[in-house]
């Protein structure tokens, strides 16, 4: 019988008492085969973290700073359940640390040196750790003691709880630096008052502070937020302009064998029976013998953290950067305006080799990082292990939902002004063999399908979106008799046709021979009835253009396109017979790397782009013998986006809506994780 006990870790006598009450009340409402609670008492949260890592306990609730400690080796814990605040309809699991300024003050984030600062309190998250962590490498050296460096950075501050004797400048705006509400500038409201009164130039608070202190929109409009990209935004745009997004209070467990499903089952049942306004007997979110025992008293319930989410992703790049800076205190030798090398994310070993070749030729301007799937690459870019990669539109959507931004677009048509003119897009098509003359768009049920990969534009999102509108369910593996859609579940009929060997079968990378445009077409040639690809795929792989044995004798005339009106047309008539227009592939990065990725890639394409005529003796960035490694092989240049610099603007309303509709069919664990952070 599996052990269904969750050993909860308590850090005080009062918590242990509440834990025992929790245990007893759960026993009274949950059947004997359901989850149960046991209580383990430790002296501190850090002791609880160590106990969970050592399998002496299973769960504890922590604030963000401790979630970071819990994630670090050798603890390796992960977030499994989040407390939420507000209502069940609009649950808040995060708050945003922001920098508020007066509208007419005219400076940006990179111009804070010499300004006057208002903090909620020394050592507090939004008011100190996050802003000072993010500014850490701009502080004057020596950076230890930190208070002295901060005092020398700003021209005056109010940092309640600081030592006014040793660091008088930190108390200049609030004599004495009192560490309670007796100091009018203490806490969130106090720090905002410090700004409002004109004592300071910037207040480091959380996003809700300004709304709690100024009910009137006209009053709020006198203030703005400083963004990390050195722009400003209105105070209600905090989701797009903050210093960090911080989880409020989170249950953590072991990453391996951590009982995360059991913990969720326990807490879900606990909130049903003992949540807000549920029971007089025992209340989960109430602490008669103290404050915030086991859980925050202000919590309204729990939400399950998506399994794909590790602590780094949960805490977010900005928060992790800030805390790491404060803890480790390491900065680059001297901050320069020079761009650091761009870390390109390469999928599997084929792309890695091409990336290494690029790295060698770029003389270190490009470095390479490997991942097994596109989603793993996106996650690495999110957390700073990698910086950039070029993505199909379907993944631009996921990357955008995860906070990344498009920076340059692949262009596929030769033009005089290629780099300045991003194209409207390419065509997603359905290709069949001419010999299968009875096959149309309307009788695909039961046929064998070939897809570039799950989640990609031409190979999945467009055809499956159209199909979903027709069949109104997500069971595409039942609609087609079998197929190859790399990235599907291995036991799905949509992996049956794939050709990868062993663990590589149906993997969404080049180790699966039927992956990508060329792979999906090969699948049609060798096994399938229909391939969902781009309009250039057939001509690029016929007429001897692809020297591989399977392709070298193919003829374009042996293939036709399926049109949505039930007719068929020759391959060259794609403009009048396609499924939809697809946005071109685009390079994505984090917002903080946008300028450098743009600059370095434009230099690189001038050196190794389509102006290089002899690719047999020189490195060519946009060539890999039909394998589409790192970039599509038909890329002519990488083009500026001008104002299409968010994923929504880049992909266009129609495509975003189409992918949004398919979301209910999504198997993307990364998309689930990112929409948890930003619904």
């Amino acid at each position: 019988v599996p052990d269904k006990t969750v050993r909860w870790c308590a850090v005080s006598e009062h918590e242990a008492t509440k834990c025992q009450s929790f245990r007893d009340h759960m026993k009274s409402v949950i059947p004997s085969d359901g989850p149960s609670v046991a209580c383990v008492k430790k002296a501190s949260y850090l002791d609880c973290i160590r106990a969970i890592a050592a399998n002496e306990a299973d769960a504890v609730t922590l604030d963000a700073g401790l979630v970071y400690d819990a994630y670090l080796a050798p603890n390796n814990l992960k977030p499994v359940v989040a407390e939420f605040y507000g209502s069940k309809e609009d649950p808040q699991t995060f708050y945003y640390a922001v920098a508020v300024v007066k509208k007419d003050s005219g400076f940006q984030m990179n111009q804070l040196r010499g300004k006057k600062s208002c903090h909620t309190g020394l050592g507090r998250s939004a008011g100190w750790n996050i802003p000072i962590g993010l500014l850490y490498c701009d502080l004057p050296e020596p950076r230890k003691p930190l208070e002295k460096a901060v005092a020398n950075f700003f021209s005056g501050s109010c940092a309640p709880c600081a030592d006014g004797t040793d660091f008088p400048q930190l108390c200049q705006l609030c004599p004495g630096c009192g560490c309670s509400t007796l100091n009018q500038y203490f806490g969130y409201s106090g720090a905002f008052k410090c700004l409002k009164d004109g004592a300071g130039d910037v207040a480091f608070v959380k996003h809700s502070t300004i709304f709690e202190n100024l009910a009137n929109k006209a009053d709020r409009d006198q203030y703005e937020l400083l963004c990390l990209d050195n722009t400003r935004k209105p105070v209600d745009e905090y989701k797009d302009c903050h210093l960090a997004q911080v989880p409020s209070h989170t249950v953590v467990a072991r990453s391996m064998g951590g009982k995360e499903d059991l913990i969720w089952e326990l807490l879900n049942q606990a909130q049903e029976h003992f949540g807000k306004d549920k029971s007089k007997e025992f209340q989960l979110f109430s602490s008669p013998h103290g404050k915030d025992l086991l859980f925050k008293d202000s919590a309204h319930g729990f939400l399950k953290v998506p399994p794909r989410m590790d602590a780094k992703m949960y805490l977010g790049y900005e928060y992790v950067t800030a805390i790491r800076n404060l803890r480790e205190g390491t900065c680059p030798e001297a901050p320069t305006d020079e761009c650091k090398p761009v870390k390109w994310c390469a999928l599997s070993h084929h792309e890695r080799l091409k990336c290494d070749e690029w790295s060698v030729n770029s003389v270190g301007k490009i470095e390479c990082v490997s991942a097994e799937t596109t989603e793993d690459c996106i996650a690495k870019i999110m957390n700073g292990e990698a910086d950039a990669m070029s993505l199909d539109g379907g993944f631009v959507y996921i990357a955008g939902k995860c906070g990344l931004v498009p920076v340059l677009a692949e262009n596929y048509n030769k033009s005089d002004n290629c780099e300045d003119t991003p194209e409207a897009g390419y065509f997603a098509i359905a290709v069949v063999k001419k010999s299968a003359s009875d096959l149309t768009w309307d009788n695909l049920k039961g046929k064998k399908s070939c897809h570039t990969a799950v989640g990609r534009t031409a190979g999945w999102n467009i055809p499956m979106g159209l199909l979903y509108n027709k069949i109104n369910h997500c069971r595409f593996d039942e609609f087609f008799s079998e197929g190859c859609a790399p990235g599907s579940k291995k036991d799905s009929s949509l992996c049956k046709l794939c050709m990868g060997s062993g663990l590589n079968l149906c993997e969404p990378n080049n180790k699966e021979g039927y992956y990508g445009y060329t792979g999906a077409f090969r699948c049609l040639v060798e096994k399938g009835d229909v391939a969902f690809v781009k309009h250039q795929t057939v001509p690029q792989n016929t007429g001897g253009k692809n020297p591989d044995p399977w392709a070298k004798n193919l003829n374009e005339k042996d293939y036709e396109l399926l049109c949505l009106d039930g007719t068929r047309k020759p391959v060259e008539e794609y403009a009048n017979c396609h499924l939809a227009r697809a946005p071109n592939h685009a390079v994505v990065t984090r917002k903080d790397k946008e300028a450098c990725v743009h600059k370095i890639l434009r230099q690189q394409q001038h050196l190794f782009g389509s102006n290089v005529t002899d690719c047999s003796g020189n490195f060519c960035l946009f060539r890999s013998e039909t394998k589409d490694l790192l970039f599509r092989d038909d890329t002519v240049c990488l083009a500026k986006l001008h104002d299409r610099n968010t994923y929504e603007k880049y992909l266009g309303e129609e495509y975003v809506k189409a992918v949004g509709n398919l979301r209910k069919c999504s198997t993307s664990s990364l998309l689930e994780a990112c929409t948890f952070r930003r619904p």
Partner: nanobody, 117 residues
Framework: QVQLVESGGGLVQPGGSLRLSCAAS????????MAWYRQAPGKQRELVAG???????TYAGSVKGRFTISRDNAKNTVYLQMNGLKPEDTAVYYC???????????WGQGTQVTVSS
Amino acid sequence: QVQLVESGGGLVQPGGSLRLSCAASGSIFSINTMAWYRQAPGKQRELVAGITRSGTTTYAGSVKGRFTISRDNAKNTVYLQMNGLKPEDTAVYYCTDYSSSYYQDYWGQGTQVTVSS
């Protein structure tokens, strides 16, 4: 197809030196960038050093200042001079010309380097 033959490996004490050679034959007109990789037991193959046709070089951080890559275009050979060898440099060393490797998955036999006292 380009054929590559690596040589020069062996057993050496920590702090010692070795010079690896890699001779290319076949369709060598297509050779542009060449590189040395290494693979230690149970680890991924990793880039050690690379050199372009014009002689521009790049090194992995762990070997910078100790290893030097060079090439002799007339002899179609690429070299890796390894000084200050450490036990963690123990691996099979492979040379590649990229045009073969990432299109055809072509690798030579490699040459074993063992650094041990």
